[in-house]
């Protein structure tokens, strides 16, 4: 029905009801919260100048900055890191984020990312945003690294929590699955982890929180000690073939 939502398809067990319903069992259908009907950049003002801006990753810096220790080229080295001005064309670099927009890091040098340099058909435009630290990049007034990437040369795969469109956008060991109303990279399930077995295609309701599929060599089967349980509450886990 319209107001029935499957909250736990391939979601983690003991899920708190996301839409005001009861229960967190895999596949449990819940009613939508009262007052809700299912139908089936701002650049923020800064509170102060706060310069130089400390950071933990490139995504926390502006589009023309990268995150690094002031005295070192690479981020992640000990000491406080701050947002530094991007490197212009032909300057030395260690990663793409160090280069100014329109450039990328190739062989340690910032080069122009002019697509005309690449053979036709080799370009796969793909915008991957790292959501690992979920909100740092975009919400207040930051800029995520929005870069048009070439698949063969410097395609960055989404890490866990990155917004994705398909599983091929995600790094190894991750798949693209629904989370709330969006899609993010989530871990592929390991042996013993709870999974969701759909009886028939199209039979499941609205899946607010999807889990990934079981990893290689694993299948989603009823957990042996749950055979006696009622049909509706049988627990499925990833098991060896």
């Amino acid at each position: 029905t319209l107001n029935s939502v499957l909250i736990n398809s391939n979601a983690i067990k003991n899920l708190p009801p996301p839409l005001g319903g009861a229960g967190g069992q895999p596949g449990s259908a819940v009613s939508v919260a009262p007052g809700v009907l299912y139908e089936g950049g701002n650049k923020y003002q800064t509170l102060d100048n706060y310069q130089p801006y400390p950071c933990a990753e490139d995504e926390e810096c502006g589009s023309d900055e990268y995150c690094s220790s002031p005295s070192r080229g690479a981020a992640g080295v000990g000491g406080v890191q701050i947002c530094l001005a991007c490197r212009k064309r032909r300057k030395r670099c260690m990663r793409h984020a160090m280069c100014c927009p329109g450039n990328y890091c190739k062989n340690g040098i910032c080069m122009p990312s002019d697509h005309s340099h690449f053979p036709r058909g080799e370009i796969e435009e793909s915008i991957i945003e790292n959501l690992g630290n979920d909100h740092n990049a975009a919400a207040g007034d930051g800029y995520p690294r929005r870069t048009t990437l070439t698949s063969k040369i410097y395609h960055t795969k989404g890490q866990e929590g990155s917004v994705c469109l398909r599983s091929s956008d995600c790094a190894a060991g991750l798949c693209c699955a629904r989370h709330f109303w969006s899609k993010i990279c989530k871990p592929v399930l390991k042996e013993g982890q709870v999974c969701t077995k759909h009886k028939r295609k199209g039979s499941h309701g609205l899946e607010i929180f999807q889990r990934c599929y079981c990893g290689e060599g694993l299948a989603c089967r009823i957990q042996k000690d749950h055979h006696q349980a009622s049909n509706s509450s049988r627990l499925h886990t990833c098991q060896r073939h």
Partner: antibody, heavy 114, light 112 residues
Framework: QVQLVESGGGVVQPGRSLRLSCAAS????????MHWVRQAPGKGLEWVAV????????YYADSVKGRFTISRDNAKNTLYLQMNSLRAEDTAVYYC???????WGQGTLVTVSS | DIVMTQTPLSLSVTPGQPASISCKSG???????????LYWYLQKPGQPPQFLIY???NRFSRVPDRFSGSGSGTDFTLRISRVEAEDVGIYYC?????????FGQGTQVEIK
């Protein structure tokens, strides 16, 4: 630059319609669920509607159901809110908002008055 | 709906002094993904919400470190270690774990 820009607000008579737009840029719009939230003059925020990343699933607040329709065009990176049968109590600044990594637009003012 | 209750509703602070705002939710905001979907934002007259804190304690980029958030489950606190003149406005908490998103009534912060 990562941003959401709303447009389409204005003064409209009760019972009439208005369509709001929200242009997204700088992020993978088609991967995010998008929301509309409104704020009546001098009041707090009120959640209005949500649409899933692919546009297939939509939810509405009771106060607007049957009158408002949320939609999106991922090819154009645009979110819409079609508002029909407008009432005086719909007067508010309407914000579009991105979920997960919360981002809001500057808002567009809708005034329903005879 | 999840009810969000803020206290106090107004706060008058001397510049340089600390300030603290409480927010209580009607049910736990802890999700099974391990995140707690509680936000703090500031709104100034005629401006959109300016987000300060996400997931209870994480500062959005460019937010000064005098702002900090804490709490878990249903009880949350926003602290400003040293209030500055530009910090005036209405502070709101918000939850996004469940539809509809709901908001606290707001705490008006003014300078003495």
């Amino acid at each position: 630059q990562v941003q959401l820009v709303e447009s389409g607000g204005g003064v409209v008579q009760p019972g009439r319609s208005l369509r709001l737009s929200c242009a997204a840029s700088g992020f993978t719009f088609s991967g995010y669920g998008m929301h509309w939230v409104r704020q009546a003059p001098g009041k707090g925020l009120e959640w209005v509607a949500v649409i899933s990343y692919d546009g297939n699933d939509k939810y509405y607040a009771d106060s607007v159901k049957g009158r408002f329709t949320i939609s999106r065009d991922n090819a154009k990176n645009t979110l819409y809110l079609q508002m029909n049968s407008l009432r005086a109590e719909d007067t508010a600044v309407y914000y579009c908002a991105r979920e997960l990594r919360v981002l809001w637009g500057q808002g567009t003012l809708v005034t329903v008055s005879s | 709906d999840i009810v969000m209750t803020q206290t106090p509703l107004s706060l008058s602070v001397t510049p340089g002094q600390p300030a603290s705002i409480s927010c209580k939710s009607g049910q736990s905001l802890l999700h099974s993904d391990g995140k707690t979907y509680l936000y703090w934002y500031l709104q100034k007259p005629g401006q959109p919400p300016q987000f300060l804190i996400y997931e209870v304690s994480n500062r959005f980029s460019r937010v000064p470190d005098r702002f900090s958030g804490s709490g878990s489950g249903t009880d949350f606190t926003l602290r400003i270690s040293r209030v500055e003149a530009e910090d005036v406005g209405i502070y709101y908490c918000m939850q996004s774990i469940q539809l509809p998103w709901t908001f606290g009534q707001g705490t008006q912060v003014e300078i003495k």
